[in-house]
């Protein structure tokens, strides 16, 4: 996990999230996403 400080005085937390592709489709393997401020963006 990474934490970034900004001049505005608030912090944004990054967290890598890993999902299994087969849970949402027919593919195998892992899907890696990034959660920023509580929202998965990738």
């Amino acid at each position: 996990d990474a934490e970034f400080r900004h001049d505005s005085g608030y912090e944004v937390h990054h967290q890598k999230l890993v999902f299994f592709a087969e849970d949402v489709g027919s593919n195998k393997g892992a899907i890696i996403g990034l959660m920023v401020g509580g929202v998965v963006i990738a």
Partner: nanobody, 124 residues
């Protein structure tokens, strides 16, 4: 819901191997992704590895890649963690946990059922 019991821990020498087992009872085993986590004294719980309900997908923490292998036998309702080339820094309590599908598998907050854990101690 599912219940989990771990076994296979113990005291080994550095470089040795262990195979941990996580046996489930209760609900349909294949409905759950299973993860292994470890917690060393005074440290936070860490993700080790996870496997999908079918066994077709796996994911490993960087520290486990190349040394640990997660697998499952759905006929026996059991998930295994084969641990090779063990190091003293692998010493920890290892616990398995079950997560509903579609949740992130590398974070402990996704897991709502936990086993009691099994102690692994690696001496130098």
């Amino acid at each position: 819901e599912v219940q989990l019991v771990e076994s296979g821990g113990g005291l080994v020498q550095a470089g040795d191997s262990l195979r941990l087992s996580c046996t489930a009872s209760g609900r349909t085993f294949t409905d759950y992704n299973i993860g292994w986590f470890c917690q060393a004294p005074g440290k936070e719980r860490e993700f080790v590895a996870a496997i999908s309900g079918s066994g077709g997908s796996t994911y490993y923490a960087d520290s486990a890649k190349g040394r640990f292998t997660i697998s499952r036998d759905n006929a026996k309702n059991t998930v295994y963690l084969q641990m090779n080339s063990l190091k003293p820094e692998d010493t920890a309590v290892y616990a398995c946990a079950a997560a509903q599908r579609r949740l992130a598998v590398n974070v402990d907050t996704s897991y709502n059922v936990w086993g009691q854990g099994t102690q692994v101690t690696v001496s130098s």
